[in-house]
Structure formats: structure tokens, C-alpha cells
């Protein structure tokens, strides 16, 4: 195992669940900072949308449309004009993503936000199966700040099956996080948006390496789950969190113990969402299967606030408030494992919208 | 096939400089851009040491052991990282390897330093 750098200087947990889980139920209402930014169209389109930070820099004119590279920001991911070429991208700039890659201008991006009564209830939709996940302390795996989020590259050998047939492998774990006064998730549930979102990402066992797999449809798999407050620590979570001030700068990526990786998702992986969209970062690219978890996690308020003031990204800028604005639906379906809309009626609904990763 | 490519090791005195190169090939070449970069060195009976990370928007953090001496650099459009190795010392002597940090590790077959008189 390689030696890590820090700084370049150098078990289950909450009782009967990993999570602490809390249902996201047909009761979740959006506050009105995080209601939607337009109401749809009449045409039942879906709008395009844009962080409320893009919504004030167009307003104030502040974006330089010259260069991919986004005026600075207190939360901000910038890059410091280092070398030449760069691909620069922030998410104080999701607005030039485009012009870092085409695919961010698809018409099935993420993330998305999840209409609960839109949902359409499909019986096919098995429980997702994990295997390997529970990690022994060694051998240890690197946790690194790459400038945009906090990453834990995942070892072989974690196997997830979507289905009959459709088995990936995980390839890294990573969060999405906002500040100690703004919610931070990336995918958004009838509007609302949660403190934080873990994503697992997992490669297809069709395909050898991710650059294969990009853009080709089920090539990439992600798990998704919400973190929500809680008054108790999740002890999972504190495995990667006690960590975070080793690796506050840019660049820093140190080894930790391995850990058990089913404990940071929901206990519950029967109740999910399920659709077809996109890396939610730059190149963007499309085809991926997202399965986003009913059940949330739950964290402490201290270890929610450890999150998102432990990091540091480009240009001595907090790390902070790193997720997308939900990208409009363009006619996708989102699939619900369970009844999930608010008239649901007995019968399922859509039954025949069900698609496999691939198809 | 190669994915990553190192290039410019050799021997070289106590107190000299080497630049070692990475080029991107094939399918590594389209996310490139989006890596973050680094260089590792492995010496004999030693476990494998990250030595430099150069993240996609160009921030740098280097191991205490070369803080100083070595520098980082990329440039996208030719898909390469350099490694600049200056006031280099014996205990430098190891197999470098390129690394492309992009979801999954991405590795080259690493090239040869050795600093001795």
C-alpha cells in the first residue's frame, strides 16, 4: 500500500441501523430557501436550473465568459492558473461547465429533484445487493482532498448487482456538502435539499477502466444516500471525519484504516430511486444509473459541521457548498422501488417505464 | 495498453537534476484533464511512497522529503506531468511512478532514478 501524505507532510454504528435511518416519506416539503426556482412550464418541461450563486453572478455580471475559469468565491473550487491547458471548473461557474465539456450541456444531467408524486412505482426494482463492503482495517485505503470533495478510493473487490446481470464493482466513495447554515445535497427531494449526500461510484464489469465506461449507457452505477441530522454521532461516518484535518489542503491524501463501507449507506436498500443521468462534476458524461436511497443517514450536528469546515479547496477557498443545481428532468422517468407518490393508488403505476441499466 | 508513460530517469550525481515526464495515452488522454496527478517512488524493500499530487486545478502539495527540491507541474493540453528533481540525493533513488487519480488509479510502469557517485 502506498504511504500517504497528509498535508504532504507528513464497526456498526447507531444500534440497529448503520444510519440511523429516517424515512424521507410524501411529507417532505420544500422551505421556501429551497423551493423549486421556477414552477414548471404548463408544457410539463422541465425548466432549466442554476445554483442561486450562478442566478447572482449573471445577475451582477460577474461571469467572464472569455474563460472557463469563474470569479472567485468564498465556497468556491478554482484553480490557479498552474501550467497550461487546465480544465478549469468551480461550482461557483456551473454555468461555463459547458465549455469545460460539452456533456455538461446534456439534456440528462444530475442531479435531479425527486418528485415524489412524478415517481413512477416500479415492482422490478429489487433490492440492491452489496458484497465485500465491509472492509478490514488493513489493508488501508487513501482518503484525499482532490480540490472539489473529500474522496476514499475504494479497494477490488466491492461488488454491487443493480439486477440479473448488471454487477459493478466500486471504485471510490465521495461527499457533497454545504455550509453550517445552508443544506448541501446534491439531488434534492420535492424540493428540499438535505445537509450533505454521499455518492459510491461503481464501474460496470463490462468495462476493464472508467474511461471505457464513460458516456455509454449503465457504464457507471452511483449510489446515493442523504445525510440528515441527528442528535446522536453515527460512528461509521467518524472513521472518515476524525480524518478531515489531515487532509485540509488541496492535494493532501493520506492512508486510513479500512472501514465498513455498507455502514455509511442507509440500512434500508429496498426503497430507492432510480434514473438515468450523469456525473454531476465535469466531463458530465451521461448513461449513469442512479439509485438514490429513500432511508437517509443520520450524523451529529458537530460531525455535519466538521464536513463542511474542514476542507479547503483552490486558492485558499473553503471547500464548501460543492454540489449542482438539479438539472431539469427533459421527459425522464424517476422510478421508485416502492410507492412513493403521494396518490399512489394500490395498484403500481408505470409498471412497463421500468428500464435496466443499459438498455 | 499504456495507459500512462514515464520517461527521464537515469543516473545522475549527488546535488543533480533530473525531469521525469508523463504522457497520457489512449483512453487516459480523455480524462486527463479532470485527474488529479501525482508521482509515487517505490525504493527496494520499501512499500510504495506518494511523493507529489498536482490536483486538476493546479493545486500542489509535496512529501516533507522533497519539499523544496522537487516541483510538480502539468499541462493539459499536452496531457503530461513533470516532476522537476533538483538537489537530488541518494536516498531519491527508487522507481518512480506516474499516477492519474480519476475514480479509479490509473498507473504507469514507472521509470528509474538512481543518484550515486
Known amino acids: 500500500q502506498p504511504q500517504g501524505l497528509s498535508g504532504m507532510q507528513g464497526e456498526p454504528s447507531l444500534g440497529d441501523s448503520s444510519s440511523g435511518e429516517d424515512e424521507l416519506g410524501v411529507d417532505v416539503l420544500p422551505s421556501e430557501e429551497d423551493a423549486p426556482e421556477e414552477a414548471d412550464p404548463p408544457d410539463g418541461e422541465d425548466p432549466p436550473e442554476v445554483n442561486s450563486e450562478d442566478r447572482m453572478e449573471e445577475s451582477l455580471g460577474l461571469e467572464d465568459l472569455s474563460t472557463p475559469e469563474a470569479p472567485e468565491h468564498s465556497q468556491g473550487s478554482h484553480g490557479d492558473e498552474k501550467g497550461g491547458g487546465h480544465s478549469h471548473w468551480s461550482y461557483g461557474g456551473t454555468l461555463l461547465w459547458p465549455q469545460v465539456s460539452p456533456a455538461c450541456a446534456g439534456r440528462f444531467q444530475s442531479p435531479v429533484d425527486i418528485r415524489l408524486e412524478r415517481t413512477a412505482f416500479c415492482r422490478t426494482l429489487q433490492p440492491l445487493e452489496l458484497l465485500g463492503y465491509e472492509l478490514q482495517p488493513l489493508p488501508e485505503l487513501s482518503l484525499s482532498n482532490n480540490g472539489h470533495t473529500v474522496q476514499l478510493t475504494l479497494p477490488p473487490g466491492l461488488k454491487m448487482a443493480l439486477g440479473p446481470g448488471q454487477e459493478y464493482r466500486a471504485l471510490q466513495l465521495h461527499l457533497h456538502w454545504g455550509t453550517s447554515d445552508h443544506p448541501g445535497s446534491e439531488h434534492t427531494v420535492n424540493g428540499h435539499r438535505f445537509p450533505a449526500e454521499i455518492h459510491v461510484v461503481h464501474l460496470s464489469t463490462a468495462f476493464s477502466e472508467l474511461h471505457e465506461a464513460l458516456g455509454r449507457p449503465g457504464g457507471l452505477a452511483v449510489l446515493a444516500a442523504f445525510l440528515q441530522e441527528s442528535p446522536e454521532e453515527n460512528s461509521a461516518y467518524e472513521q472518515l471525519l476524525s480524518h478531515l484535518e489531515e487532509i485540509s489542503e488541496e492535494g493532501s491524501k493520506i492512508e486510513i484504516p479500512g472501514l465498513d463501507v455498507s455502514a455509511l449507506l442507509p440500512s434500508d436498500l429496498s426503497r430507492y430511486y432510480r434514473y438515468e443521468g450523469s456525473l454531476t462534476t465535469p466531463p458530465c458524461s451521461q448513461g449513469v444509473i442512479w439509485t438514490v436511497f429513500n432511508e437517509t443517514v443520520k450524523l451529529s450536528a458537530k460531525q455535519l459541521h466538521t464536513l463542511s469546515v474542514s476542507l479547503w479547496g483552490p486558492r485558499d477557498s473553503r471547500l464548501q457548498l460543492n454540489f449542482r443545481a438539479t438539472q431539469p428532468l427533459n421527459g425522464r422517468t424517476i422510478e421508485a422501488s416502492f410507492p412513493a407518490a403521494e396518490d399512489s393508488s394500490p395498484e403500481p403505476v408505470h409498471v412497463n417505464s421500468c428500464f435496466t441499466a443499459g438498455d | 495498453q499504456v495507459q500512462l508513460q514515464e520517461s527521464g530517469g537515469g543516473l545522475v550525481q549527488p546535488g543533480g537534476s533530473l525531469r521525469l515526464s508523463c504522457a497520457a495515452s489512449g483512453g487516459a488522454r480523455n480524462i486527463f484533464s479532470f485527474a488529479a496527478m501525482a508521482w509515487y517512488r517505490q525504493a527496494p524493500g520499501k512499500q510504495r511512497e506518494l511523493v507529489a499530487v498536482?490536483?486538476?486545478?493546479?493545486?500542489?502539495q509535496y512529501s516533507s522529503s522533497v519539499k523544496g527540491r522537487f516541483t510538480i507541474s502539468r499541462d493539459n493540453a499536452k496531457k503530461t506531468v513533470l516532476l522537476q528533481m533538483n538537489s537530488l540525493k541518494p536516498e531519491d533513488t527508487a522507481v518512480y511512478y506516474c499516477n492519474a487519480d480519476y475514480y479509479q488509479d490509473y498507473w504507469g510502469q514507472g521509470t528509474q532514478v538512481t543518484v550515486s557517485s
Open positions: 498536482i490536483t486538476s486545478a493546479g493545486g500542489t
